[in-house]
Interface confidence: low
């Protein structure tokens, strides 16, 4: 039977941080400034991500790994790998197309990002409002009116402001 020819690709010897340079008989050349290769055997190096304008460098680009960006103060990351920076608002506000706007009555936002959410409706759980809500804080639900008979415990722990497992970024 005829043996299949197995010629090893010379580029496979080029480690991360280099590229297989076709202009120089496929020798392994180091990635030029402002570029990187994160795996071996690459024929080109990738241009480093530029953290410009509202983006700021969180991790410097090296010959083997891309730069990582975050956002300058007053902005926060959105998207995979911080692909976008979105303007922060104050607590009690949400970002609209026209900028930061105060939460409408009956809603709150306790973060610098995200949207205003409705206050918890205590009556749905048969509870009463112990502490009124504000633009920045949810209401605190207390015991139901029936629980406030003499001798009853005066306060139950407030319901969590967020769904379990959800935490600010």
């Amino acid at each position: 039977f005829e043996r299949t020819r197995s010629l090893q690709d010379p580029c496979s010897n080029c480690p991360a941080g280099t590229f297989c340079d076709n202009n120089r008989n496929q020798i392994c050349s180091p990635c030029p400034p402002n570029s990187f290769s994160s795996a071996g055997g690459q024929r080109t190096c990738d241009i480093c991500r530029q953290c410009k304008g509202v983006f700021r460098t969180r991790k410097e680009c090296s010959s083997t790994s891309n730069a990582e960006c975050d956002c300058t103060p007053g902005f926060h990351c959105l998207g995979a790998g911080c692909s976008m920076c979105e303007q922060d608002c104050k607590q009690g506000q949400e970002l609209t197309k026209k900028g930061c706007k105060d939460c409408c009555f009956g809603t709150f936002n306790d973060q610098k990002r995200g949207i205003c959410r409705p206050w918890t409706n205590c009556s749905l759980d048969g509870k009463s409002v112990l502490v009124n809500g504000t633009k920045e804080r949810d209401v605190v639900c207390g015991p139901s009116p029936a629980d406030l008979s003499p001798g009853a415990s005066s306060v139950t722990p407030p319901a969590p402001a967020r769904e379990p497992g959800h935490s600010p970024q």
């Epitope: 400034p33 241009i47 991500r49 530029q50 953290c51 410097e60």
Partner: antibody
């Protein structure tokens, strides 16, 4: 070696416009940000903006957003800055300067000799 | 925008003495890794020349009598010993964010 060639001078009428050139050589033009800096006679340095030739992406200082437009011609490795609605305040030396790379922040390593723009009737 | 305030505006120094130029930023331009502050020298009729990058790193070919220090908001350029050819204007510049800005300049004169 890296070289940035700029014309020595340009004379322009008030209200007119001018397109300054900066021809780069000695490096891969598309891989480095090119910046422009203004210096009025006897004054300090003002950063105008920069352009990344590979993508054409630009940044401008607020003051120059309606004054300067940065472009490149990658086939000739030349950066351009178009200045419009010129007044005597625009009379200055304009430098092109190439950034050196380190992560996302840069120093201005290589400078052209500058073009003196004179706005005069 | 980040404002860079240089002092003094003018600095007369005797040959062989130490020249110290200060640059103060209106906000921090440093991370734990780097300070994004650079120093340039400009002689009359010439473009600026990079001397010090990232606060303290001497650019290739620049004499060792130039040194830079500082982090956060306060940075210093030192020249010692001062030589005749050091007569020039010196500028600090940050690259922390867009827009980059320069200090107002310090004119060094040999007295």
């Amino acid at each position: 070696q890296v070289q940035l060639q700029q014309p020595e001078s340009e004379l322009v009428r008030p209200g007119g416009s001018v397109k300054l050139s900066c021809k780069a050589s000695g490096y891969t033009f598309t891989s480095y940000w090119m910046d422009w800096v203004k210096q009025r006679h006897g004054q300090g340095l003002e950063w105008i903006g920069n352009i990344y030739p590979d993508s054409g992406g630009t940044n401008y200082a607020e003051k120059f957003k309606s004054k300067a437009t940065l472009t490149v011609d990658t086939s000739s490795s030349t950066a351009y800055m178009h200045l419009s609605s010129l007044t005597s305040e625009d009379s200055a030396v304009y430098y092109c300067t190439r950034e050196e790379a380190l992560g996302g922040y840069y120093e201005l390593t290589y400078w052209g000799q500058g073009t003196l723009v004179t706005v005069s009737a | 925008d980040i404002v860079l305030t240089q002092s003094p505006a003018s600095l007369p120094v005797s040959l062989g003495q130490r020249a110290t130029i200060s640059c103060r930023a209106s906000q921090s331009v440093s991370t734990s890794s780097y300070s994004y502050m650079h120093w340039y020298q400009q002689k009359p009729g010439q473009p600026p020349k990079l001397l010090i990058k990232y606060a303290s790193n001497l650019e290739s070919g620049v004499p060792a009598r130039f040194s830079g220090s500082g982090s956060g908001t306060d940075f210093t350029l030192n020249i010692h010993p001062v030589e005749e050819e050091d007569t020039a204007t010196y500028y600090c510049q940050h690259s922390w964010e867009i827009p980059y800005t320069f200090g107002g300049g310090t004119k060094l004169e040999i007295e």
